[in-house]
Structure formats: C-alpha cells, structure tokens
C-alpha cells in the first residue's frame, strides 16, 4: 500500500485530489499496518496470571510475564498498538515458574514509537478537503523485563 | 513535522509540488522521527558483556542483558531503528549477576514494526517528480527476555 508524494512540497508535501471522495477503506487499509502484538494474542490467556508457563508465547514463558492491551485509534498510523502490562511485581522463580523472587523486579520496557496522526491541516479546518499526517512519538511499553534492582551509589 | 494530504486521492494520495526542490533537511526531519533506542545508547557500554549490572539502563540491568545495534536507512521512516542483540544464551543469576542459570533461556522478542519507504512511484521512474511512501512491516528484535525453556507436549 503506497502513499504517493510529489517532490518539493512546502509542507512535505501538499497534495491534490483525483476523485471526489476517498473511501474509508483506503485510509484504513493504509493505516491498519499492523494489527498484531509481538506475540500472538490468541495465546495471551497463558499470561493472565503471575506465573511463567513452559509453553505458549514469549510473554507467558517469561519470568517477567506480561499481557498485551490494545490501544486503537482509527486516525493513527498504525491504528492498533499494544502495550505490555506486567503481571508480577517481581520475577518468577526459574525453578518453580510460580513463586516470586524478591531479588528481581519485573519492569516494563518503554519506547517512544513513531506514529502518524490524521489531522486537519493548520489553517484549513473549514475546507474539509485536505488532511495532514502529523508525526509524533508515542510512548508504548514493549515488554516486561526481569532486572536486578537498582543500587544507588 | 506534518505531511499534508489532500482528501480523496486515488493512490491515497497523489500530490502536487509547491516549490522546485525539496531540501534534504525536510525529508530527513520528517523521516528521522526517532533516533534513540528504548534505552539511552550512551549507557550501552554497561551491557556489552554477559552480566546483569546493578545500575544503568534496563538492557544492562536485565538478567537477559542485551545491546542495541543501529539499523539505518535514509529512505525509510523511521530512518533509524535499533535491534536488540542478546549478550547471553541463558539468563544470568539474580544472586550473582554474572553466572548463567541453565534453567532459563535469554531470547529475543521480535516484532513486525510498521515502516515506510520512499520509493519511485510505480510506472513513473522516468518523471523525476513524484515519490511514493510504501508501507511495510519490518522485523526488529525489541529486547531480550528470560524465559523458561519450552517443554514440548
């Protein structure tokens, strides 16, 4: 799915219509780039409790298990993002897969992801003909990680 | 930084010039959306060996430590991506922070990230005027996770 751009536009770039109205399917086809989290959602029931499974996807086998929570915005590219939610405050023991080990903390790994929002173009709110894709950094939690607690100097 | 789009374009969308040439800064300002990994690169020296630190960023404090490796393509949005490279085959002991525990595997968590490539528009290679943004899914490793080894049924 391509977005066609003319070289040399002042707002990088400014665009022209070629038909009266863009069907909603077109925008959604382009914006719904990825509708799956890193690990298949079909398996995330494994990881809904504070235990490390011996099968299933990574997020349920991790000793810092997490579940995925959907974040959907139809005016954003990508339209669906997934946030990792840690299921345990501490890491689960490798031996048992269930008891928590206070020596380790289960913490979210955050990342500022590039996203694009569909917006009315500045100063053109009344025209209803143009829209802008505005680039933003959006904070998502990617996964939960088992770390040694920070020791302050 | 915005990309201005006219509603209703057949290729979602087709665009018009407003000046003769786009300066490189414009494209790169738009494409270099995120030039940092989830954890600051300035600290990644902590994570270059197979040990879990008691300070520094998450990737060095994790018992499945990793380093970040840059993936740069000036014709992609975002231009810079970072891949996590696991520094240990097994998880590091929470007690010592250095000895590996064979009960746990340190494995990369992969994700298909939405990216956009600047391309000549299909069938317009000779015009030198348009370019297209092509949406793709691009596989990146986000982090390394300590998991219990999979037990096959």
């Amino acid at each position: 799915v391509s977005l066609r751009i003319q070289e040399g536009c002042s707002h990088l770039p400014s665009c022209c219509p070629s038909k009266e109205q863009e069907p909603p399917e077109e925008w959604l086809k382009w914006s719904s780039a990825s509708v799956s989290p890193p690990e298949p959602l079909s398996h995330t029931h494994h990881a809904e409790s504070c235990r490390a499974s011996k099968d299933g996807p990574l997020n349920s086998r991790a000793i810092s298990p997490w579940s995925y929570e959907l974040d959907r915005d139809l005016n954003r590219v990508p339209q669906d993002l997934y946030h990792a939610r840690c299921l345990c405050p501490h890491c689960v023991s490798l031996q048992t897969g269930s008891h928590m080990d206070p020596l380790g903390n289960s913490v979210p790994l955050y990342h500022n992801q590039t996203v694009f929002y569909r917006r009315p173009c500045h100063g053109e709110e009344g025209t209803h003909r143009r829209y802008c894709l505005e680039r933003r950094l959006y904070r998502v939690s990617l996964a939960c990680v088992c770390v040694r607690p920070r020791v302050m100097a | 930084v915005s990309l201005r789009i006219q509603e209703g374009c057949s290729h979602l969308p087709s665009c018009c010039p407003s000046k003769e040439q786009e300066p490189p800064e414009e494209w790169l300002k738009w494409s270099s959306a995120s030039v940092s990994p989830p954890e600051p690169l300035s600290h990644t020296h902590h994570a270059e060996s197979c040990r879990a630190s008691k300070d520094g960023p998450l990737n060095s404090r994790a018992i499945s430590p990793w380093s970040y490796e840059l993936d740069r393509d000036l014709n992609r949005v975002p231009q810079d991506l970072y891949h996590a490279r696991c520094l240990c085959p097994h998880c590091v002991s929470l007690q010592t922070g250095s000895h590996m525990d064979p009960l746990g595997n340190s494995v990369p968590l992969y994700h298909n990230q939405t990216v956009f490539y600047r391309r000549p528009c299909h069938g317009e290679e000779g015009t030198h005027r348009r370019y297209c943004l092509e949406r793709r899914l691009y596989r990146v490793s986000l982090a390394c996770v300590c998991v219990r080894p999979r037990v096959m049924a």
């Epitope: - | 494209w27 790169l28 300002k29 030039v35 600047r118 015009t127 370019y131």
Partner: antibody
Framework: QVTLRESGPALLKPTQTLTLTCTFS??????????LGWIRQPPGKALEWLAH???????HYKPALKSRLTISKDTSKNQVVLTITNVDPVDTATYYC?????????????????WGQGTLVTVSS | DIQLTQSPSFLSASVGDRVTITCSAS?????MYWYQQKPGKAPKPLIY???NLASGVPSRFSGSGSGTEYTLTISSMQPEDFATYYC???????????FGQGTKLEIK
C-alpha cells in the same frame, strides 16, 4: 565542484598505527544525509569498504575490522580521519575516501558519487 | 553479512559486442549500484539504484534486476569500456557497504 584528497604515510612497519586524512571541498559534511566513507583496494584485488561517518556523527565499521578502526570528522576543517591500529602487510592497499549523500526524487543513493584519487600505503618490515 | 558474487570474473569481448555482467547477492536486496574502474584510477559511478544512469554515462550502459540477481549490460562495447566493473550494495542492518569481487573486461 566536489573534490576529495587522501593523505597519509606511504610506508609503515607492522604493528604501527595508520592515520589517514581525507580533506574535501565543494560540500559540507554537516548537511543532512551527507556521509563519507573509506574504501581500500589491495594491489590487483577488489574494493573493500572499511568505515563510514554520517553528518550526525553516526559511525559504521566493517564488522571484521571494527576493533582496529576509528573514523572521526572535523566539520570546520572539512576533514575526515581514519585510523587503523596494529597494521600488517595485508593492510597494504590504495586507500580511497568517497562521498555519499545524493538525494533524488525517489530518495537517497547509497553509492559513492565522488572519490578521491587514492593514496597507496605499504606495510612492510 | 550479505555476500556479492560477480560473474564472470574475467571477460574477453570485442568492440561492438553486447556484454552482460551478473551480480548475485546471498540474500534479497532492494537495489544494486555499479562502478567502472580503470587502472590507476578511482572507481567511477555508472548505475544508481539498479537502473538509473549516473551523470555523463552513455546510454549503452544499463542496469536491471531485483531480489538476489542484478545485471549490468553494455549494449555495444566501445574501446573506452574496457575496464573493471564492480557491483555494490548497502545493507541497513548492520549498516555496511559491500562490493563484488569485480569483473575485468578485456579486449579479445
């Protein structure tokens, strides 16, 4: 007009450190998208890419040589310096610096569009 | 690392011949670049992005290909075309530039 010129010692002994300087004109290495690389060519052999530095000071190295290479830039002097530690006779080659950073309507090219004339470095005891 | 293999390594041709040089990548790549090098001189860019001619390059040179297979074609060899030709690619991760081993084009 774009020009690049390499300079450095013509002869070194094994284990010494090679320092090569590329002095350029006609473009600025602070321009977004601009980069400068080093390529070498042993006598009668193929081209081998060694290192690259971008306008924003991001550096890349050939993985097999990474531990021995350092690239740096001085934008105000229009110079890029490559150092190779612990040289060996197999490092005998003509060393070229070359520019990358041509923006077309379809994007950036990863070809080296301007090259220096090269400088021959011999490593011998 | 992606490897590039050029074939043939040596090629004898006559003026007026049509010549094709192939460059094979060990895994799929987006684009290929081509250079011409004459003895004692620096390489000169010939083809950008698989098929775009560099400035000042005669139209008898052309490039094509996709995926792992790329070709440089000289439609009618001229005396000044006898040289060594190199293919080159850029790989974004890890960021590396790779050259083929070269094809030496000699007069038959």
């Amino acid at each position: 007009q774009v020009t690049l010129r390499e300079s450095g010692p013509a002869l070194l002994k094994p284990t010494q450190t090679l320092t090569l300087t590329c002095t350029f004109s006609g473009f600025s290495l602070s321009t977004s998208g601009m980069g400068l690389g080093w390529i070498r060519q042993p006598p009668g052999k193929a081209l081998e890419w060694l290192a690259h530095i971008w306008w924003d000071d991001v550096k890349h190295y050939k993985p097999a040589l990474k531990s021995r290479l350092t690239i740096s830039k001085d934008t105000s002097k229009n110079q890029v310096v490559l150092t190779i530690t612990n040289v060996d006779p197999v490092d005998t080659a003509t060393y070229y610096c070359a520019r990358m950073g041509q923006l077309h309507y379809y994007g950036y090219d990863y070809a080296m569009d301007y090259w220096g004339q090269g400088t021959l470095v011999t490593v011998s005891s | 690392d992606i490897q590039l293999t050029q074939s043939p390594s040596f090629l004898s041709a006559s003026v007026g011949d049509r010549v094709t040089i192939t460059c094979s990548a060990s895994s799929s790549v987006s684009y290929m670049y081509w250079y011409q090098q004459k003895p004692g001189k620096a390489p000169k860019p010939l083809i950008y992005r698989t098929s775009n001619l560099a400035s000042g390059v005669p139209s008898r040179f052309s490039g094509s290909g996709s995926g792992t297979e790329y070709t440089l074609t000289i439609s009618s060899m001229q005396p000044e075309d006898f040289a060594t030709y190199y293919c080159q690619l850029y790989h974004s991760y890890p960021p590396t530039w790779t050259f083929g081993q070269g094809t030496k084009l000699e007069i038959k």
